[in-house]
């Protein structure tokens, strides 16, 4: 029983349980394909426990392997709409530091209006994740349609 | 080595490893959009460790942040079928207690026959999750095509 | 503080944190629908911590419940291409030992060019997972478009 007590007394941070789930705040200005995220209990069911937001982008605070997941739904979209607009693509990647810049996850919408995926990837303290949406259809801001999150899995 | 032994002796429940993976049992009656789930080793590869089923809906037994995931495939479906029966939408939400009712995850099929997604969300003991399928196409009951699960991630 | 120290000193393997993320190496010969995977830091961001590769297929080393996830993108694909080459299907299953052979996860591309999904499933030491792609379109080998992974979740 001593172990269970010790576990409860330890701060969760020491167990490396960093986790975040974000909702869409807004899209970027004209030449900026990035999505800008927000999180926190005042906003609904989004949260940040460990990672932080830096100008709407997610910054990692603990080295480790993470499960990264995302869903983006295009607003006012049908398969017809999607086919009549420039191909829409979503890419999640490390955008800073520049030396570690890489695309982690990429999906095209084709004739669909939602993409959803997830992957395991090593991330390091200070890595900032960016989600780039290219295309001419606006992403939905509904919190059950568009969200982005990470979960620390192991060192 | 004492720690490893202690860990093995502790019931998993004390580590908060609640997890469930369910397979489709049946759809609801005429005016009920809910999918009804079932789980247990006798049924194949579905299981419940912590959460419980309440009349085919998943009830949470431990507070925490959970990864919720789902895949639903429409039966006897092609992109032509899907577009002719549009819109078919799947929503996962907390349906009880009523005071906590909220949609957590929503996807439309558009011209596709399968949706799959996942998200992190806080859930509380007693929350019941419902999966509502609106549309006129039946979901497949194949266990590798339609499934629904949750995994406790952290307090 | 003793617990935290002990936790750090214990090999991660004793915590059961088996995890792997693989990238596509190549497709199989004519009559072999399997995808052949590769992983390791020399290849980029793929890795194996616990599970092993056996002739390009993933072999499990620890009993438990795993989160299995996959994304496969078809190369040189548009919704028109996809619909003209229908049906392309991806199935993830246990392919050996033969006594445990079963399909765990199945998706069709229909008019899309990417499938992505995930599920929880019990796996046993020695289980080998195969990913079968049927159809006439080649999968992309881009590491941000096609990947396959598992994460040990609990015993």
């Amino acid at each position: 029983q001593r172990f269970a007590q010790a576990q409860q007394q330890l701060p969760l941070e020491s167990l490396g349980w960093d986790v975040a789930e974000l909702q869409l705040n807004h899209t970027g200005p004209q030449q900026d394909p990035r999505l800008y995220w927000q999180g926190g209990p005042a906003l609904g069911r989004s949260f940040l426990h460990g990672p932080e937001l830096d100008k709407g982008q997610l910054r990692i605070h603990r080295d480790g392997i993470y499960m990264v997941h995302i869903q983006v739904t295009l607003a006012i979209c049908s398969s017809t709409t999607a086919s009549r607009h420039h191909p829409t693509t979503l890419a999640v990647g490390i955008c800073s530091p520049a030396s570690r810049s890489i695309s982690l996850l990429r999906l095209s919408f084709h004739q669909g209006c939602t993409i959803a995926s997830q992957r395991l990837t090593p991330l390091a303290r200070g890595d900032t994740l960016c989600t780039n949406l290219t295309g001419t259809l606006l992403p939905s801001r509904n919190t059950d349609e568009t969200f982005f999150g990470v979960q620390w899995v192991r060192p | 080595q004492r720690f490893a032994q202690a860990q093995q002796q502790l019931p998993l429940e004390s580590l908060g490893w609640d997890v469930a993976e369910l397979q489709l049992n049946h759809t609801g009656p005429q005016q009920d959009p809910r999918l009804y789930w079932q789980g247990g080793p006798a049924l194949g590869r579905s299981f419940l460790h912590g959460p419980e089923l309440d009349k085919g809906q998943l009830r949470i037994h431990r507070d925490g942040i959970y990864m919720v995931h789902i895949q639903v495939t429409l039966a006897i479906c092609s992109s032509t079928t899907a577009s002719r029966h549009h819109p078919t939408t799947l929503a996962v939400g907390i349906c009880s207690p009523a005071s906590r009712s909220i949609s957590l995850l929503r996807l439309s099929f558009h011209q596709g026959c399968t949706i799959a997604s996942q998200r992190l969300t806080p859930l509380a003991r007693g929350d019941t999750l419902c999966t509502n399928l609106t549309g006129t196409l039946l979901p497949s009951r194949n266990t590798d095509e339609t499934f629904f699960g949750v995994q406790w991630v952290r307090p | 503080q003793r617990f935290a120290q002990a936790q750090q000193q214990l090999p991660l393997e004793s915590l059961g944190w088996d995890v792997a993320e693989l990238q596509l190496n190549h497709t199989g010969p004519q009559q072999d629908p399997r995808l052949y995977w590769q992983g390791g830091p020399a290849l980029g961001r793929s890795f194996l911590h616990g599970p092993e590769l056996d002739k390009g297929q993933l072999r499990i080393h620890r009993d438990g419940i795993y989160m299995v996830h996959i994304q496969v993108t078809l190369a040189i694909c548009s919704s028109t291409t996809a619909s003209r080459h229908h049906p392309t299907t991806l199935a993830v299953g246990i392919c050996s030992p033969a006594s445990r052979s079963i399909s765990l996860l199945r998706l069709s591309f229909h008019q899309g060019c990417t499938i992505a999904s995930q599920r929880l499933t019990p796996l046993a030491r020695g289980d080998t997972l195969c990913t079968n792609l049927t159809g006439t379109l080649l999968p992309s080998r881009n590491t941000d478009e096609t990947f396959f992974g598992v994460q040990w979740v609990r015993p």
């Epitope: 899209t27 607003a75 009549r84 420039h86 001419t136 939905s140 | - | -």
Partner: antibody, heavy 119, light 111 residues
């Protein structure tokens, strides 16, 4: 700099057809839908439809569906709007317009083409 | 089709005073976390100029005396301090669904 340059004014007889062009420059032509909006003298604005230059797919306002055709020529980065069976009430300034990043609102406009329908 | 009703038809305001234009949609133009309402200014012999998009976002280069508000069916364009160069006709437009439709316009003049 994004520019939309339209063809010159036209005078047409009732029952005839008119084809107005809109030449785009300063951006990747196939990326952005081009919309057409008309304005009768002293009246408000009326959306006619749009075309996606990437594949030529067009969507029309039901009001004009039987009479309007939108096409594009990717080699010259030009979009065309043809209106047939002209009547006097089609007398208007016809504008092509483009959105900035996301579709739905128009940040860039052509200078307008006056089409006069008169017997 | 969604019908857009603008009021008033015309408005005379003193220089430096506030001008308020209203636009009502026949049904809600808000969905997916946005209000699909946009405002334009048009001067004689010129094409319309985008002022406000998605109900409240100021288009680049537009003076900040222009602002937009509202959601659902009721929207407002406000000019906080009218300048001589603001004399024009102002139109609202929705993009909630096809066909897009415009309001009938409001003519703003100096009193």
């Amino acid at each position: 700099e994004v520019q939309l340059v339209q063809s010159g004014a036209e005078v047409k007889k009732p029952g005839a057809s008119v084809k107005v062009s809109c030449k785009a420059s300063g951006y990747t032509f196939t990326t952005y839908n081009i919309h057409w909006v008309r304005q009768a003298p002293g009246q408000g604005l009326e959306w006619m439809g749009d075309i996606y230059p990437g594949n030529g797919d067009a969507s029309y306002n039901q009001k004009f569906r039987d009479r309007v055709t939108m096409t594009r020529d990717t080699s010259t980065s030009t979009v065309y709007m043809e209106l047939s069976s002209l009547r006097s009430e089609d007398t208007a300034v016809y504008y092509c317009a483009r959105f900035s990043r996301f579709d739905g609102w128009f940040a860039y406009w052509g200078q307008g083409t006056l089409v006069t329908v008169s017997s | 089709d969604i019908v857009m009703s603008q009021s008033p038809d015309s408005l005379a305001v003193s220089l430096g005073e506030r001008a308020t234009i209203n636009c009502r949609a026949s049904r809600s133009v808000s969905t997916s976390g946005y209000s699909y309402m946009h405002w334009y200014q048009q001067k004689p012999g010129q094409p319309p100029k985008l002022l406000i998009y998605l109900a409240s976002n100021l288009e680049s280069g537009v003076p900040d005396r222009f602002s937009g508000s509202g959601s659902g069916t009721n929207f407002t364009l406000t000019i906080s301090s009218l300048q001589a160069e603001d004399v024009a006709v102002y139109y609202c437009q929705h993009s909630r669904e096809l066909p897009y439709t415009f309001g009938g316009g409001t003519k703003v003049e100096i009193k």
